[in-house]
Interface confidence: low
């Protein structure tokens, strides 16, 4: 048994053009953890394989924001050494993948967000007990520093961590058939019980008089190097071209067993010692259960309670995996209707909404004419969202803020003079027809043809017949500006009560958004 | 040298808003993330928010439930704080103050702005 | 929100002589911790940062030291220009948060 320790000395941009983005900004300030995973062998295992060495999750880096204009700096990392134990012979040939994770702290729904930044992998022999090993690997722009080692857990020693160590029986001596252990001085060495000759760096044995070889070497002792083997075959019983005997294939070769279990063979099969958290014929099911927080995110476990059940996680918006550990777009899950456009702004989403909608989600058909939609004294037509106005005279547009001449569309009948006033528009009739647009003849029999008067005004009067049409004017002036006071008004009230449901919806999505 | 002048002392009405500037020099401005902090009378220093000029992207303080707005002109090299919907107790010296680095926090300061809110 | 908690609120020291205060978070903030100094009719002044970290221009007087909750700051041998507020503010997370200041006076 031994631990496997991984210390990572910096994250942050390689060199070379191609500045990475800064993971984190001032709105979204993150921080990182690393993941290392750990499989037996030389073998390229996709990241999916189990990490079958076993696998460890670092404690949480320093919040971090991004600074703007500064260069690029190494990453703030989290405290201590990542430590991966194994329960048997460290296998001194070994793949990792090491990966950078971001945690976002935002507001986001249901806490915060992980997503995975770089990847690296790689393949590396290594005796438990020696130095720290130093590496950089590169993953796009990114560059990590790291060292690691292998170290026996006491009473296992040697390169493979199979040699076991006693406590000294008597404080100057080893006891009975015990000889002093190194490095550990106060410690002794348990006789050797392997096969005579076995390798003491890549040979280990369980039972005594067996020689059991590490990854990549082989012969009866582990003493011949896999890559220059003179045998062609390393499987099946002999090769007839070189006659070496080789084992041929065991039950527990490739080791079967998922997760870090240790494979033994049994005279029908093999069997697998599961570590702690996994069970199942090959250890490939996690005992994990609700009681261990598996759920990220916010997620609600089911299931669990009991070492023979599975647990799910039900993931809140946002997020999915079987853990709830990825972040889904939550725009395209398609949150604003009627035609909204979605921004994730991370701690939340908003909807910009088109003319005529309102609400969280656009949700709501407004009542256009609650938006003052029509300008200069337009009445406004409701209309399903699609409003229209009824322009006050001398506008006309959609909204009434164009300037219309009101004589354009010749609204004086019979040839009677149309003046533009502020108030709309004038016709002077010509002679014969009077009305505000010279519709009704003066007399329809045909009897005169002398011009018309208004009722009450002798003809050839033309200083009265002016002032009433200077009073007639003055009262329809007087009743538009009454008529613009009262809308004014009414679209206040209007508004002050739309104004208010509004600043209710927004509370009712921040709540919403933060629950 | 590296300077940040705030505008003059502000009274204000209850339910009003105050704007309040930190005219930046000495540096590059849209190369520092910039804090705005406030300090009632006999009160502890209270952070409201920050803004990264480059994007005008920006952080606030949920304590004040949306009443602050933070906002740069770059042009001018200029931050501005407003705050709405004032009470008394926003009574107080408001103060920008420059981001250094990823792990230093504000190392130059404005001289205050005093804010004072009365009906 | 983190609460830093300073103490004492107020010192009184002779001069020459070593002033130490304190600082507590309510939870770990690994080593973000800084100390500032407040003087009337001057700018508040970034003495220390990261726990530790002494900011250029500062006399070497001023040391910080501590990590995860508890720190502290210590004027090795106070002179009379240190007679000011001292405050600690936690840059961990946001919102960044303050500690309700040390008056240091000359005994």
């Known amino acids: 048994a031994g631990v496997f320790e991984l210390q990572i000395h910096s994250f942050g941009p390689g060199p070379g053009p191609g500045a990475p983005r800064s993971p984190c900004s001032a709105r979204l300030p993150c921080r990182l953890f690393f993941r290392v995973c750990l499989k037996p062998g030389l073998s390229e295992e996709a990241a999916e394989s189990p990490c079958a060495l076993g696998a460890a999750l670092s404690a949480r880096g320093p919040v971090y924001t991004e600074q703007p204009g500064a260069p690029a700096p190494d990453l703030p990392l989290p405290d201590g050494l990542l430590q991966v134990p194994f329960r048997d012979a460290w296998p001194g040939t070994f793949s990792f993948i090491i990966e950078t994770w971001r945690e976002e702290l935002g507001d986001q729904i249901g806490g915060p967000a992980w997503s995975l930044l770089a990847r690296v992998a790689g393949r590396r022999r290594l005796a438990a007990g020696g130095p720290w090993a130093r590496d950089i690997q590169r993953a796009g722009a990114w560059e990590l520093r790291f060292s690691y080692r292998a170290r026996c857990e006491p009473p296992a020693v040697g390169t493979a961590c199979t040699r076991l160590c006693r406590p000294r029986s008597a404080p100057s001596r080893c006891g009975p058939g015990l000889r002093p252990c190194a490095p550990l001085e106060d410690e002794c060495e348990a006789p050797l019980v392997c096969r005579a000759g076995c390798s003491p760096e890549h040979g280990f044995c369980e039972q005594p008089g067996e020689c059991r070889c590490l990854e990549g070497w082989t012969g009866p002792l582990c003493t011949v190097p896999v890559s220059t083997s003179s045998c062609l075959s390393p499987r099946g019983p002999s090769s007839a071209t070189t006659g070496c005997l080789v084992p041929g294939p065991g039950p527990c070769d490739g080791n079967p067993c998922a997760n870090g279990g240790s494979c033994s063979e049994t005279p029908r099969s093999f069997e697998c010692t599961c570590p702690r958290g996994f069970y199942g014929l090959r250890c490939e099911v996690s005992g994990v259960t609700c009681a261990d927080g598996p759920c990220f995110n916010g997620g609600l476990c089911v299931g669990g309670a009991d070492p023979d059940s599975a647990y799910i996680c039900h993931c809140p918006p946002g997020f999915q995996g079987s853990n709830c550990e990825k972040r889904v777009d939550r725009c395209s899950l398609q949150p604003c209707r009627n035609g909204g456009l979605c921004l994730d702004l991370g701690h939340a989403l908003r909807c910009r909404c088109r003319a005529g909608f309102a609400g969280p989600r656009c949700e709501h058909d407004l009542d256009d004419c609650a938006g003052r939609a029509c300008a200069n004294g337009g009445t406004c037509v409701e209309g399903g969202g699609a409003h229209r106005c009824s322009c006050a005279l001398g506008f006309g547009g959609r909204d009434c803020r164009e300037r219309a001449d009101p004589c354009a569309a010749r609204p004086c009948a019979h040839g009677g003079r149309c003046y533009a006033h502020f108030s709309g528009l004038v016709c002077a009739c010509a002679p014969g027809y009077m009305g505000a647009r010279c519709e009704f003849p003066v007399h329809p029999d045909g009897a005169s043809a002398l011009p018309a008067a208004p009722p009450g005004l002798r003809p050839g009067d033309p200083q009265r017949y002016l002032a009433g049409v200077i009073a007639v004017i003055v009262v329809v002036v007087i009743a538009i500006v009454a008529g613009i006071v009262v809308l004014v008004i009414s679209r206040k009230k209007r508004m002050a009560k739309y104004e208010k449901a509004e600043i209710k919806e927004m509370g009712e999505m921040h709540r919403e958004l933060n629950a | 040298e590296v300077q940040l002048v705030q505008s003059g002392a502000e009274v204000k009405k209850p339910g009003a808003s105050v704007k309040v500037s930190c005219k930046a020099s000495g540096y590059t401005f849209t190369s520092y993330w910039m804090h705005w902090v406030r300090q009632a009378p006999g009160q502890r220093l209270e952070w409201m928010g920050v803004?990264?000029?480059?994007?005008?992207?920006?952080n606030y303080n949920q304590e004040f439930k949306g009443r602050v707005t933070i906002t740069v002109d770059t042009s001018a090299s200029t931050a501005y704080m407003e705050l709405s919907s004032l009470r008394s107790e926003d009574t107080a010296v408001y103060y920008c103050?420059?981001?250094?680095?990823?792990?230093?926090?504000?190392?130059?300061w404005g001289q205050g702005t005093t804010v004072t809110v009365s009906s | 929100d983190i609460v830093m908690t300073q103490s004492p609120d107020s010192l009184a020291v002779s001069l020459g002589e070593r002033a130490t205060i304190n600082c507590r978070a309510t939870k770990s903030i690994s080593k973000y911790l800084a100390w500032y100094q407040q003087k009337p009719g001057q700018t508040n002044k970034l003495l220390i940062f990261s726990g530790s970290t002494l900011q250029s221009g500062v006399p070497d007087r001023f040391s910080g030291s501590g990590s995860g909750t508890d720190f502290t700051l210590t004027i090795s041998s106070l002179q009379a220009e240190d007679v000011a507020v001292y405050y600690c503010?936690?840059?961990?997370?946001?919102?960044?948060?303050f500690g309700g200041g040390t008056k240091v006076e000359i005994k």
């Open positions: 103050a420059r981001d250094s680095t990823v792990v230093a926090p504000m190392d130059y």
């Open positions: 503010q936690q840059h961990h997370e946001y919102p960044y948060t």
């Open positions: 803004i990264d000029p480059s994007d005008s992207l920006a």
